[in-house]
């Protein structure tokens, strides 16, 4: 018979034949042959593989480094990685939670809508038209543009969400 060019789900093609993939939590020791099944071995104590695979090495569980403010939220198994979270009152810097911050800052162009608490991180909002923020801050709201008119001045440069307006003297020349 013709050697296969594709294999079923949970199989892989090697040496013109379809071998079974190793199940999650196990790594490949040796490919199948015409006479033997794929040989797999369970991952070690601090290792995992989370898919049907032909990996020869298991992945190391993530280390939740206490020096970065991390602690274990969920211990890893042979089929799942460890999930880290931050110490109480601290917040993850990303979905993967690789490090912790006390709170995040709102970038220029954004103001603080709600200051961080022990439970929730800083909530930022874009500065609307007429307001700006030129700093990175965890407490400052968007500031209103300066009103040139109230100072008997005129707008020389328009404001943006990151910059205030620039006021200047009125043109004294009259037609």
């Amino acid at each position: 018979p013709e050697p296969p060019t594709a294999c079923r789900e949970k199989q892989y093609l090697i040496n013109s034949q379809c071998c079974s993939l190793c199940q999650p939590g196990q790594k490949l020791v040796s490919d199948c042959t015409e006479f033997t099944e794929t040989e797999c071995l369970p991952c070690g104590e601090s290792e995992f593989l989370d898919t049907w695979n032909r990996e020869t090495h298991c992945h190391q569980h993530k280390y939740c480094d206490p020096n970065l403010g991390l602690r274990v939220q969920q211990k890893g198994t042979s089929e799942t990685d460890t999930i880290c979270t931050c110490e109480e009152g601290w917040h993850c810097t990303s979905e993967a939670c690789e490090s912790c911050v006390l709170h995040r800052s709102c970038s220029p162009g954004f103001g603080v809508k709600q200051i961080a608490t022990g439970v929730s991180d800083t909530i930022c909002e874009p500065c609307p038209v007429g307001f700006f923020s030129n700093v990175s801050s965890a407490f400052e709201k968007c500031h209103p543009w300066t009103s040139c008119e109230t100072k008997d001045l005129v707008v020389q440069q328009a404001g943006t969400n990151k910059t205030d307006v620039v006021c200047g003297p009125q043109d004294r020349l009259r037609a």
Epitope: L68, G69, C100, L102, V135, S137, E140
Partner: nanobody, 116 residues
Framework: EVQLLESGGGLVQPGGSLRLSCAAS???????EVWWVRQAPGKGLERVS?????????YYADSVKGRFTISRDDSKNTLYLQMNSLRAEDTAVYYC?????????WGQGTLVTVSS
């Protein structure tokens, strides 16, 4: 490596005053927003006060408004918290924190105990 060292804590009677200091070494406070944060025994972190990088804007938690004053001296690379009219509920370890607020920009804290 940035190190923040808080000092000035101690035992004080209700109604008394203390001035906390936070000195930065290995880096600078200049131009950075800085916070005072406290942790009372058995409680979570509470954000007490903050000062902008320019020193022009400040924030105070409602619980300390009118009693605490935050200030900075960038020439001395030091942050201050003047605490007046102290109450028993101000008892806590006080920490300073500098932008970017990562765990390694975090001091050991100074203990303030308000008790008669």
């Amino acid at each position: 490596e940035v190190q923040l060292l808080e000092s000035g804590g101690g035992l004080v009677q209700p109604g008394g005053s203390l001035r906390l200091s936070c000195a930065a070494s290995g880096s600078t406070f200049a131009g950075y927003e800085v916070w005072w944060v406290r942790q009372a025994p058995g409680k979570g972190l509470e954000r007490v006060s903050a000062i902008s990088g320019s020193g022009g804007s400040t924030y105070y938690a409602d619980s300390v408004k009118g009693r605490f004053t935050i200030s900075r001296d960038d020439s001395k690379n030091t942050l201050y918290l003047q605490m007046n009219s102290l109450r028993a509920e101000d008892t806590a370890v006080y920490y300073c924190a500098r932008d970017p607020y990562s765990f390694d920009y975090w001091g050991q804290g100074t203990l303030v105990t308000v008790s008669s």
